[in-house]
Each structure stands twice: as structure tokens, then as C-alpha cells.
Interface confidence: low
């Protein structure tokens, strides 16, 4: 008799999830010598242990603590780049500017990037059919709790000047409900972080507006200032040129406004 399975509103666990996580871990530890000591089988076991046999709407940060411990990593805390709704450009940037790091440049972020996963209560099965949607089903699902946990830790680790890349093409350039707005902003430590500098990325070719004056950016500035952290903002009018100039800063065209 086929067992009744809860139907959730979100997509199911990514195909070949265990193999993907293990393969990514092996690849990451090969590329990053400082993480060569990591035992990827133990990492997978800890990852699996966070959600297998647990109700996928009842996951806690504590469930992920064994994984967090195994994934502890030293990142220069003054080289952190946060992002919101503009992941691809942020990743392109850190691929060029190798001494800066997004969350997905760390082991734990790299393992989970773009993946979905969940289990079922009281069974060791992974649910490949459906997983809870954050809005329609529940917020304490395995994926959301994972990103909340690693994002909080990443923000807590930051120091000096922290940069955040924001999407200037969106109606809410700064969104209080994004991971950046709801988790990272509130976990920057004023005793370590001097300034949050926002880079607002323009989408349109002819867009010369000062998006740093956008009401949502003013809202971000207000939140940050109340936390005793200085705020600054820069318009990146030409993201293509911006990346090009990061690659080749000596280029004569890079002295003009980007």
C-alpha cells in the first residue's frame, strides 16, 4: 500500500541531492587548501541529520549546529560582500576580485547554493516530490532555516567596511523581507563594523538617476544608523563596465564614472 505523503506547495528536493552535496564538498575542499581537513562524508552526515526524519515545518537553527561546526571557516572579515536580489553579479564580482567573499564563496554557502531539500517526519526518506514553500506553507522549513542560520553567522563575522550589492531595477531596492533585510542587516556587529556601503546596481543603459536617494535606501540608512553603524551608498551605473574595470583597473576608461 503506497504511504500517504504530505503535498507541499514548493518544488521537491533537488534531484541527486546527496550526490550533489558530497561532490560539491569534495570539489570545494580540493580548490581551497585551508579546508582540506574537512571530511566530506561527515559534512553530508551532519547535513542529512539536520532535516531527515524531522517534520519539514519544524526545523530549528539548532538542527544545523553540527553542520555549522564542521563548516567553520576563516574568511577575512573585512572582505565580505553581501547581496540582495542580484546574486549573479555578486558572484561574478568575487570571481574577479578574488580577495572578497560572498556567502556562496564559503563552504556551507557553496554546498547549498540553488538547491532545495526536505525530509519527512518519522521516515528516513528524502522528499523529492514537494517541499514547504516559505510563504504558502511555513517559514521553519529546512532550506529557509539553513539560509537564515548561515546568513546570520556570516553577517556576525563581518568587520570594518561591509559591502552590499543591491538591485536597482527592483521596485524595492532594499527589501526588509529579503535575507539581507531581515537577517544580515540586524546581525552586523557595531563593535566590529564601521560602515555598511551599498552598491546600487543600475539596470538601464540610460539610467542616470541617483538611486541612493531611493526611499528604500533611506530606510536602510535609517536602520543601519540606529545600529550605530555608518552608511554609505554608491551608484553603479554600468555594471558591465564595473566588472571590466575590476578586471583591468589600469584601463583608461576606468577613470570616468562607472
Amino acid at each position: 500500500v503506497p504511504r500517504w505523503r504530505q503535498q507541499w506547495s514548493g518544488p521537491g528536493t533537488t534531484k541527486r541531492f546527496p550526490e550533489t552535496v558530497l561532490a560539491r564538498c569534495v570539489k570545494y575542499t580540493e580548490i581551497h587548501p585551508e579546508m582540506r581537513h574537512v571530511d566530506c562524508q561527515s559534512v553530508w552526515d551532519a547535513f542529512k541529520g539536520a532535516f531527515i526524519s524531522k517534520h519539514p515545518c519544524n526545523i530549528t537553527e539548532e538542527d544545523y549546529q553540527p553542520l555549522m561546526k564542521l563548516g567553520t571557516q576563516t574568511v577575512p572579515c573585512n572582505k565580505i560582500l553581501l547581496w540582495s536580489r542580484i546574486k549573479d553579479l555578486a558572484h561574478q564580482f568575487t570571481q574577479v576580485q578574488r580577495d572578497m567573499f560572498t556567502l556562496e564563496d564559503t563552504l556551507l554557502g557553496y554546498l547549498a547554493d540553488d538547491l532545495t531539500w526536505c525530509g519527512e517526519f518519522n521516515t528516513s526518506k528524502i522528499n523529492y516530490q514537494s517541499c514547504p514553500d516559505w510563504r504558502k506553507d511555513c517559514s521553519n522549513n529546512p532550506v529557509s532555516v539553513f539560509w537564515k542560520t548561515v546568513s546570520r553567522r556570516f553577517a556576525e563575522a563581518a568587520c570594518d567596511v561591509v559591502h552590499v550589492m543591491l538591485n536597482g531595477s527592483r521596485s524595492k531596492i532594499f527589501d526588509k523581507n529579503s535575507t539581507f533585510g531581515s537577517v544580515e542587516v540586524h546581525n552586523l556587529q557595531p563593535e566590529k563594523v564601521q560602515t555598511l556601503e551599498a552598491w546600487v546596481i543600475h539596470g538601464g543603459r540610460e539610467d542616470s538617476r541617483d538611486l541612493c536617494q531611493d526611499p528604500t535606501i533611506k530606510e536602510l540608512e535609517s536602520i543601519i544608523s540606529k545600529r550605530n553603524i555608518q552608511f554609505s551608498c554608491k551608484n553603479i551605473y554600468r555594471p558591465d563596465k564595473f566588472l571590466q574595470c575590476v578586471k583591468n583597473p589600469e584601463d583608461s576608461s576606468c577613470t570616468s564614472e562607472i
Epitope: T72, C77, C159
Partner: nanobody, 124 residues
């Protein structure tokens, strides 16, 4: 390995200014690798961050103490100093000088490096 040593009077009168110095050895206080700060622990309570100073010279202070605190560095002596004005009995605490390492592991602040602490009692 960085070592930090606090020094200053153990007894301060109410309404006076508390002045402490921290001598750093094993590393340069002006190095961009580190940031510095002061924390304190009142008797029977938890640690409280007082403020931090960066290699650029800019400072950040605990909002509740901001109006009374000054943190500065003397690079020639490799020293960090704390001045807390208009003290009251509520400022009685063990005061620690602390250093953060930009390349240190996640979540260690404010105790990457910390002095032994010095007890300051505010009393007439």
C-alpha cells in the same frame, strides 16, 4: 601572539574620569590586520562592549556610553587608551582591553585577544 596588558587606577571617585591604558605586545597597534576595543564586566553581570577603534582612527561606541567615552591609540607607544567621564558606582567593573583579528575565525570577538582585565571600583 598578541598580548595585551591593562593598567590604571583601581579606585576612581564618582563624577571623575576613569583613565585606562592598554599596552600591546607581539604586534603593531597600527596594523590594518587588527581592530581594538574595550569591554567591561560589572560584578555578577555579563560582558558589555564599550567601544572600538579601527586602524583608520575612526571609532564606534556603545550608544548607552557614547557621550562619556573616548578611545584613542598612541602608535608610538603601541598603546590603546580609554577615558570614561562622569563615572558612577554603576561603572564599577573589570575592564578588558580587547583585540580583534580580521583573519581570525568567525564569531570570536571580542575575545580573539584580551588582556587579563583590571578591576575599577567607583567609590568615594
Amino acid at each position: 601572539q598578541l598580548q595585551l596588558q591593562e593598567s590604571g587606577p583601581g579606585l576612581v571617585k564618582p563624577s571623575e574620569t576613569l583613565s585606562l591604558t592598554c599596552t600591546v605586545s607581539g604586534g603593531s597597534i597600527s596594523s590594518s590586520r587588527y581592530y581594538w576595543g574595550w569591554i567591561r564586566q560589572p560584578p555578577g553581570k555579563g560582558l558589555e562592549w564599550i567601544g572600538s577603534i579601527y586602524y583608520s582612527g575612526s571609532t564606534n561606541y556603545n550608544p548607552s556610553l557614547k557621550s562619556r567615552v573616548t578611545i584613542s591609540v598612541d602608535t608610538s607607544k603601541n598603546q590603546l587608551s580609554l577615558k570614561l567621564s562622569s563615572v558612577t558606582a554603576a561603572d564599577t567593573a573589570v575592564y578588558y582591553c580587547a583585540g580583534g583579528d580580521r583573519y581570525g575565525p568567525v564569531g570570536q570577538w571580542p575575545s580573539d585577544y584580551r588582556g587579563q582585565g583590571t578591576l575599577v571600583t567607583v567609590s568615594s
